[in-house]
């Protein structure tokens, strides 16, 4: 009798249960970017290491051609850090008619591309003015949040200036996502 | 009959399922650091509060001697924020032959130690030049990402200068990890 | 016989298992803030979009009156980013008796309110001195960590100066939480 009482709820909730270990997951790490032309008003996408060192993709989460491919619908936590580095930004020295000029800036955007949708969707943006005085500078921008994604969605990381990205260490610049 | 049809798939997927509530988890919070000797070229590790206030460890995730001990293999999300504070860095004012000197910087590293492996592995690094003008300064560095860890791995947080860490509030400087 | 051997462990661990898809989750995005009175020494709370664009609440996680309501006890990952923007902070130029004045700053606090407890609890704080030279400035503060919450707890995001918050884009300023 006890078994019979238990069965219905067991059957009712069983279907959506799944082992955590088989959920799509990826952690990608920075590689040196190859020289490419990119349009002036479009932020270029970074490409990534997906299997060497700390990088991995698993459970049908694949990386191809700068994109992470989402293999199943659900809620994902998505994160990225990009470390930027540069020589002095002279933004504080150049003034027009005594007025501060537009600051230099660094920006990271995590973008979702859905094939059935014409425009990419910006999921996360970190943007920072850079107005350093008298020295080299370096700093990270970190982003992370949860989004509902559909099977077939593609994720990429875009930056305002690819030449400012620190590609020297896998722990400084990275990109990841995992199904919750 | 229905039960018989259901049984195979139940037995097949059941083993790896586990209750979310029993997964290893920890959130550690800052405490005032005790002065310790550390080698000149090695970043010192922070020690942490693990049970008072917001801090906790649970489900066999233990904290001991600056390390979080990983009790079972799997994919973990690891995070830390360190808030730094200091007096004015005059890096922009001191010049050699009209040349800006090397900037001061603040750095946080989350490091993995595996007993069977001679060298620690840097999992995450946040590093920032500090060239503030005319005032005291304070700022956080935040890090977080997912890594595949093995049972017995140990995690610690290293900083470039322990004397600059803001230890005054548990919400400003913290370190955590949880099994996904 | 096999079924009988299996049953006890099944019944023993079954109760806490639950489908990941039915866990409380929310991602809230920035909206333009309505002018409100707030006490001088108290950081104002932001209000949020909870259903348009990228924003959502699900599985009994509700948003009401600047608060996220926690519908069940457990360990939650909570995160927020606030992008600030402002005109030049002249903090380095104004000195009293040759001494640098107290720097301007920007601060984000994620706060927990428990009705049975008189004082709100600050879970996370990101605070940064702002001493920019010669230009407009903008920058994000990101926070994220895991906390043990109780059913009925309420979460909000407070900022040091609501007029500096960039409310222009949903990907720049956001707040979220999900049950682990």
């Amino acid at each position: 009798l006890k078994g019979q009482e238990f069965a219905p709820s067991h059957q009712q909730v069983y279907a959506p249960l799944r082992a955590d270990g088989d959920k799509p997951r990826a952690h990608l790490t920075v590689v040196r970017q190859t020289p490419t032309q990119h349009f002036k008003n479009q932020f270029p996408a970074l490409h990534w290491e997906h299997e060497l060192g700390l990088a991995f993709t698993k459970n049908r989460m694949n990386y191809t051609n700068k994109f992470l491919l989402i293999p199943e619908s659900g809620d994902y936590f998505i994160y990225s850090q990009v470390t930027f580095r540069g020589m002095t930004s002279e933004c504080s020295e150049i003034r027009q008619a005594g007025r501060p000029n537009k600051p230099d800036s660094i920006t990271v955007v995590i973008t979702k591309v859905t094939d059935s949708y014409p425009e990419p969707t910006q999921l996360l943006m970190g943007t920072k003015s850079v107005c350093e005085v008298g020295s080299n500078w370096f700093q990270p921008i970190y982003l992370g949040a949860m989004f509902s994604l559909q099977e077939g969605d593609k994720l990429m990381v875009n930056v305002s200036d690819i030449s400012l990205v620190d590609y020297t260490k896998e722990d400084k610049t990275f990109f990841g996502a995992f199904l919750l | 009959l229905k039960g018989q049809e259901f049984a195979p798939s139940h037995q097949q997927v059941y083993a790896p399922l586990r209750a979310d509530g029993d997964k290893p988890r920890a959130h550690l919070t800052v405490v005032r650091q005790t002065p310790t000797q550390h080698f000149k070229n090695q970043f010192p590790a922070l020690h942490w509060e693990h049970e008072l206030g917001l801090a906790f460890t649970k489900n066999r995730m233990n904290y001991t001697n600056k390390f979080l001990l990983i009790p079972e293999s799997g994919d973990y999300f690891i995070y830390s924020q360190v808030t730094f504070r200091g007096m004015t860095s005059e890096c922009s004012e001191i010049r050699q032959a009209g040349r800006p000197n090397k900037p001061d910087s603040i750095t946080v590293v989350i490091t993995k130690v595996t007993d069977s492996y001679p060298e620690p592995t840097q999992l995450l690094m946040g590093t920032k030049s500090v060239c503030e003008v005319g005032s005291n300064w304070f700022q956080p560095i935040y890090l977080g990402a997912m890594f595949s860890l093995q049972e017995g791995d140990k995690l610690m947080v290293n900083v470039s200068d322990i004397s600059l860490v803001d230890y005054t509030k548990e919400d400003k400087t913290f370190f955590g990890a949880f099994l996904l | 016989l096999k079924g009988q051997e299996f049953a006890p462990s099944h019944q023993q661990v079954y109760a806490p298992l639950r489908a990941d898809g039915d866990k409380p989750r929310a991602h809230l995005t920035v909206v333009r803030q309505t002018p409100t009175q707030h006490f001088k020494n108290q950081f104002p709370a932001l209000h949020w979009e909870h259903e348009l664009g990228l924003a959502f609440t699900k599985n009994r996680m509700n948003y009401t009156n600047k608060f996220l309501l926690i519908p069940e006890s457990g360990d939650y990952f909570i995160y927020s980013q606030v992008t600030f923007r402002g005109m030049t902070s002249e903090c380095s130029e104004i000195r009293q008796a040759g001494r640098p004045n107290k720097p301007d700053s920007i601060t984000v606090v994620i706060t927990k309110v428990t009705d049975s407890y008189p004082e709100p609890t600050q879970l996370l704080m990101g605070t940064k001195s702002v001493c920019e030279v010669g230009s407009n400035w903008f920058q994000p503060i990101y926070l994220g960590a895991m906390f043990s919450l109780q059913e009925g707890d309420k979460l909000m995001v407070n900022v040091s100066d609501i007029s500096l918050v960039d409310y222009t884009k949903e990907d720049k300023t956001f707040f979220g939480a999900f049950l682990l």
Partner: antibody, heavy 119, light 111 residues
Framework: QVQLVQSGAEVKKPGASVKVSCKAS????????INWVRQAPGQGLEWMGW????????GYAQKFQGRVTMTADRSTSTAYMELSSLRSEDTAVYYC????????????WGQGTLVTVSS | QSVLTQPPSVSGAPGQRVTISCTSS?????????VHWYQQLPGTAPKLLIE???NRPSGVPDRFSGSKSGTSASLTITGLLPEDEGDYYC??????????FGGGTKLTVLG
């Protein structure tokens, strides 16, 4: 001390390929990117591309894309640059150079390899 | 496509000071990694003189210094010596992550 020793001079016919080697010593070969730079007689320096000896990843100048291949043999700490479909204007001294990771300056240079393309 | 422009030649007597300029066709000369300077003496491989606008690698005499102003970088040699005669190149990285070299400047030490 750090040394980059390149292979000897080569004479090639138009349309042929040449493979120049660069043997590294005095440092951990996989820790630094190698760049290749060439210099035509009486001309300036021209960058061809970079190689990461650890991963094998490469980045080539647009001008040489499709004609150049850079590889590494980690067991012998040797980098290679192969240029195909040679023409007379490829006559030059070819240099390998080790890069400073932080600034991407070319800190150490090989002695150069003269490649002559002539029918 | 960015271009780095150097004067084809400069000259000076021993003991004098000479400056070689390197001007970028784009506004952000070496924004990410700076401008580097190389010396190439006759019949030899280039040698790194200055990295990141200002920094002298060990072994480079302090007679060599680098500076930056707006879209130009400069190499200054003080106390010119006969053995400084040779070609000098500036180098940077453009926005597409391609390395650029200036056309080179021939330094002649008079006398």
């Amino acid at each position: 001390q750090v040394q980059l020793v390149q292979s000897g001079a080569e004479v090639k016919k138009p349309g042929a390929s040449v493979k120049v080697s660069c043997k590294a010593s005095g440092y951990t070969f996989t820790s630094y990117d190698i760049n290749w730079v060439r210099q035509a007689p009486g001309q300036g320096l021209e960058w061809m591309g970079w190689l990461n000896p650890n991963s094998g990843y490469t980045g080539y100048a647009q001008k040489f894309q499709g004609r150049v291949t850079m590889t590494a043999d980690r067991s012998t700490s040797t980098a290679y640059m192969e240029l195909s479909s040679l023409r007379s204007e490829d006559t030059a001294v070819y240099y390998c150079a080790r890069e400073v990771p932080e600034t991407a300056a070319f800190e150490y240079w090989g002695q150069g390899t003269l490649v002559t393309v002539s029918s | 496509q960015s271009v780095l422009t150097q004067p084809p030649s400069v000259s000076g007597a021993p003991g004098q000071r000479v400056t070689i300029s390197c001007t970028s066709s784009s506004s952000d000369i070496g924004a990410g990694l700076g401008v580097h300077w190389y010396q190439q003496l006759p019949g030899t491989a280039p040698k790194l003189l200055i990295e990141g606008y200002y920094n002298r690698p060990s072994g480079v005499p302090d007679r060599f210094s680098g500076s930056k102003s707006g879209t130009s970088a400069s190499l200054t040699i003080t106390g010119l010596l006969p053995e400084d005669e040779g070609d000098y190149y500036c180098q940077s990285w453009d926005g597409t992550l391609s390395a650029l070299f200036g056309g080179g400047t021939k330094l002649t030490v008079l006398g």
